[in-house]
């Protein structure tokens, strides 16, 4: 049994935080090629540490098992008496098979009429279920498939002649919205330039898109 | 020693109940099924019920099922006899009996000494 | 139900005399019979079960035998102290029924 407080259960203690170098080391630091981090745990304490894990997972499943099978036991004794013969012979073992038989059979007319209820209250909730679908039917609306479709040729399906007027509004203000637009775009332009220009960027930038 | 003393006997009236005590000792009382067997002024013995050793399971003849009803305490080491719906014929000197059993034959191998019952108008 | 008869319900005998008590079922019972003996004061015991098996603490005097529906109980050499009614019980079926009984008397 592994216990919870032995060594190979135990996390390994959390690496110190590094310590700040300065600015200067960094350079070497980066172009040097450092070694592989060397593992801390051997390839032998790995497999230990790999076994007992197992073995705690073992453990897990076997207790679980145990349970169920505890919970089985514990949900029979509730339900079948033990037998309790001593001191009874043929005579009370004859009419005791009798009782049992007697309360077999009521028990299985009790299940009877369960079963009866239940299978009732399923073709009752299939009934339903069918009307339900039957009444979804009179009102089935068409399954809607995604379609790219532009806010005009939108606006014309859903108004029809009356959207002509809208669209020609929609579409001046497209229009001014557009010019200004390509103001604003030719001014930021030209200050780029020259910012380019004075920073000797131009040359560079042109070599760079060709 | 093997011993039961039965208690709670007396004379009542047709249609009435009592309730019967046998106090058992000298022996593991819930290891044993155990009876009552009721005498008539007849002298007749008439076997009136058996509960087995945990209580579980009781037998009745026809002539008392659905009246008398067999209990026991097994903490108490007491066995009961409740008694309803008493008729003249049930007037008897009732026993408290041990069970116990050979190759499937059963027994009465222990008796009390038993309590008088007279249901008279 | 199973009846039980005795073929005589008293019987005389005197002391040191060998008596032996009968009993009938109504069908085989397969030895699942006892007898019990109750004295005056209206103590019951068990002497004999399963036919032939003699209860501890009584006398090997009594004797028991018998197969299907004979059976019978025998007493040999009679004592003051065997002086009682004598009951066979069937144990092979509910209800368990008793005979009538046997008083057994002094001559």
């Known amino acids: 049994m592994a216990d919870g407080s032995s060594d190979a259960a135990r996390e390994p203690r959390p690496a110190p935080a590094p310590i700040r170098r300065r600015s200067s080391n960094y350079r070497a630091y980066a172009t040097e090629p450092h070694a592989k981090k060397k593992s801390k745990i051997s390839a032998s304490r790995k497999l230990q540490l790999k076994t007992l894990l197992l073995q705690i997972a073992k453990q897990e499943l076997e207790r679980e098992a145990e349970e169920r099978r505890g919970e089985k036991g514990r949900a029979l004794s509730t339900r079948c008496q033990p037998l309790e013969l001593a001191g009874l012979g043929f005579a009370e073992l004859q009419d005791l098979c009798r009782q049992l038989h007697a309360r077999v059979d009521k028990v299985d007319e009790e299940r009877y009429d369960i079963e009866a209820k239940v299978t009732k209250n399923i073709t009752e909730i299939a009934d339903l279920t069918q009307k339900i679908f039957d009444l979804r039917g009179k009102f089935k609306r068409p399954t809607l498939r995604r379609v790219r479709i532009s806010a005009d040729a939108m606006m014309q399906a859903l108004l029809g002649a009356r959207a002509k007027e809208s669209l020609d509004l929609r579409a001046h203000l497209k229009q001014v919205k557009k010019e200004d637009t390509e103001k604003e775009n030719r001014e930021v332009g030209d200050w780029r330039k020259n910012i380019d220009a004075l920073s000797g960027m131009e040359g560079r930038k042109k070599k760079f898109e060709s | 020693e093997v011993q039961m003393v039965e208690s709670g006997g007396g004379l009542l009236k047709p249609g009435g109940s009592l309730k019967l005590s046998c106090a058992a000792s000298?022996?593991?009382?819930?290891?044993?099924?155990m009876s009552w067997v009721r005498q008539t002024p007849e002298k007749r013995l008439e076997w009136v019920a058996t509960?087995?050793?945990?209580?579980?399971?009781?037998f009745y003849p026809d002539s008392v099922k659905g009246r008398f009803t067999i209990s026991r305490d097994n903490a108490k080491n007491t066995l009961y006899l409740q008694m309803l719906s008493l008729r003249s014929e049930d007037t008897a000197m009732y026993y408290c009996?041990?069970?116990?059993?050979?190759?499937?034959?059963?027994?009465?191998?222990?008796w009390g000494q038993g309590s008088s019952v007279t249901v008279s108008s | 139900d199973i009846q039980m008869t005795q073929t005589s319900s008293s019987l005389s005998a005197s002391l040191g005399d060998r008596v032996t008590i009968s009993c009938r079922a109504s069908?085989?019972?397969?030895?699942?019979l006892n007898w019990y003996q109750q004295k005056p004061d209206g103590t019951i015991k068990l002497l004999i079960y399963?036919?032939?098996r003699i209860h501890s603490g009584v006398s090997s005097r009594f004797s028991g035998s018998g197969s299907g529906t004979d059976y019978s109980l025998t007493i040999s050499n009679l004592e003051q102290e065997d002086i009682a009614t004598y009951f066979c019980?069937?144990?092979?079926?509910?209800?368990?029924t008793f005979d009538t009984g046997t008083k057994l008397e002094l001559k």
């Open positions: 009996a041990r069970r116990d059993n050979y190759y499937g034959s059963s027994f009465m191998d222990y």
């Open positions: 000298g022996f593991t009382y819930s290891n044993y099924a």
């Open positions: 509960i087995s050793s945990g209580g579980s399971y009781s």
């Open positions: 069908q085989d019972i397969t030895n699942y």
């Open positions: 399963y036919t032939s």
């Open positions: 019980q069937q144990g092979h079926t509910i209800p368990l």
